[in-house]
Amino acid sequence: MRTEAQVPALQPPEPGLEGAMGHRTLVLPWVLLTLCVTAGTPEVWVQVRMEATELSSFTIRCGFLGSGSISLVTVSWGGPNGAGGTTLAVLHPERGIRQWAPARQARWETQSSISLILEGSGASSPCANTTFCCKFASFPEGSWEACGSLPPSSDPGLSAPPTPAPILRADLAGILGVSGVLLFGCVYLLHLLRRHKHRPAPRLQPSRTSPQAPRARAWAPSQASQAALHVPYATINTSCRPATLDTAHPHGGPSWWASLPTHAAHRPQGPAAWASTPIPARGSFVSVENGLYAQAGERPPHTGPGLTLFPDPRGPRAMEGPLGVR
């Protein structure tokens, strides 16, 4: 069992909870409801999990649901750097990953999501209220940031409702294009809810699948959407005690440096990969306005020729930036 804090998900209730209600009539309203609720939320979602077997071990997962090609992802805890936050990992799609203790493993899960595992310290319930923040940047178009933390209760069913906040800092084109569909969906949802108003509403359950396991495909982006959804993903297991945190310093190297090739298996491409992309279900959501930081004093090694700050489509290993040719 896991304790989770997540941004609302585009995910239906688990099979078997519908009772006498038909599966189709149950899933569609709830998918539409989620779309309506999340229509105005930021494009970044954050999921924090604490393993029951290792109560001091955390997995942070972050994803970017907007259009645009991400050129850098930063994961931190304790808030933004101006308020005492500490960088746990920095992930670049071409040049690799930097991470600092207590981060144990940071990696790209998909092109639009990352995960970070934090080492456990053995305490029974460390840092239950620790805030983890993820910042996705696409230079120079803009950056997007969101934060999340474990709910006060360890019962996933008692997760706090999402608190969307206006933290987007880039073009909203691509999001606005969906508004028409959402409007129609919301109207249709109201119609369906009126038809089923005398039936008991099913409970949305948080997913208990592993971060890598495919989830119910209640909302799989169309191929057109897939082209616009380029999001890095990272997982982190960390020890959650600031006192024991091995803080990185500007002139000190990272605890270790991993240079990941762009064809790494953690960054699948194509419709199949997108269809199985895990999407968080729900939880607490906190916005952070100022930037995060990473103590990266030394320039990381290049993984090979042709590596790019702005991924270049002309290269064999590259991707193009979000705005295309002007």
Epitope: Y293, H302, F310
Partner: antibody, heavy 120, light 106 residues
Framework: EVQLVESGGGLVKPGGSLKLSCAAS????????MSWVRQTPAKRLESVAT????????YYPDTVKGRFTVSRDNAKNTLYLQMSSLRSEDTAMYYC?????????????WGQGTSVTVSS | QIVLTQSPAIMSASPGEKVTMTCSAS?????MYWYQQKPGSSPRLLIY???NLASGVPVRFSGSGSGTSYSLTISRMEAEDAATYYC?????????FGAGTKLELK
């Protein structure tokens, strides 16, 4: 050692054109976004153009949009700024600068600058 | 675009004195940087993303802030620190700079 060397500046009449160059060395040029930043006689700094590492995406502030064009030749490790329809307010010292993504796109290296004077 | 206002425009300090200058943004900023420029030289990166020292920058320099308010502090002024300091933000394009704070040696 990272080096950025600008050239091409000079005196030009209003409405005229000028092409600046920035020769880069000491790093993998094709891996970095680059910008042109100018400093006016009043010592104000203004970013006038940014280009991604592959040379595909370019960005300009409204003050120069349609008049300035940034480009790069990664094979020659050179950044360019084509300036046309020049105005007196374009008079400035023009610097090329490198953006380092692991420093959150800070401009970590700057050239020595080339002076552009627009006057009749 | 985001406008950055630096204050004071000009200040002076004696060697060993603590110096603090501020940079106020017209709206919330994602990334803040500080540059130092001496007469006849190009700008030099001091601090990136609010509080991180660039390579080779003395530890007497520090940055802090969040949202719309940022500051650069020199814990103990030294003669070589006399220069003009610029803040720069990146939130979305265009990148913008403050007008600068000129720090003179008293």
């Amino acid at each position: 050692e990272v080096q950025l060397v600008e050239s091409g500046g000079g005196l030009v009449k209003p409405g005229g054109s000028l092409k600046l160059s920035c020769a880069a060395s000491g790093f993998t040029f094709s891996s970095f976004a680059m910008s042109w930043v100018r400093q006016t006689p009043a010592k104000r700094l203004e970013s006038v153009a940014t280009i991604n590492n592959g040379g595909i995406n370019t960005y300009y502030p409204d003050t120069v949009k349609g008049r300035f064009t940034v480009s790069r030749d990664n094979a020659k490790n050179t950044l360019y700024l084509q300036m046309s329809s020049l105005r007196s307010e374009d008079t400035a010292m023009y610097y090329c600068a490198r953006h380092d993504d692991f420093l959150y796109y800070a401009m970590d290296y700057w050239g020595q600058g080339t002076s552009v004077t627009v006057s009749s | 675009q985001i406008v950055l206002t630096q204050s004071p425009a000009i200040m002076s300090a004696s060697p060993g004195e603590k110096v603090t200058m501020t940079c106020s943004a017209s709206s919330s900023v994602s990334y803040m940087y500080w540059y130092q420029q001496k007469p006849g030289s190009s700008p030099r990166l001091l601090i990136y993303d609010t509080s991180n020292l660039a390579s080779g920058v003395p530890v007497r320099f520090s940055g802090s802030g969040s949202g719309t308010s940022y500051s650069l502090t020199i814990s103990r002024m030294e003669a070589e620190d006399a220069a003009t300091y610029y803040c720069q933000q990146w939130t979305s394009y265009p990148l913008t700079f403050g007008a600068g704070t000129k720090l003179e040696l008293k």
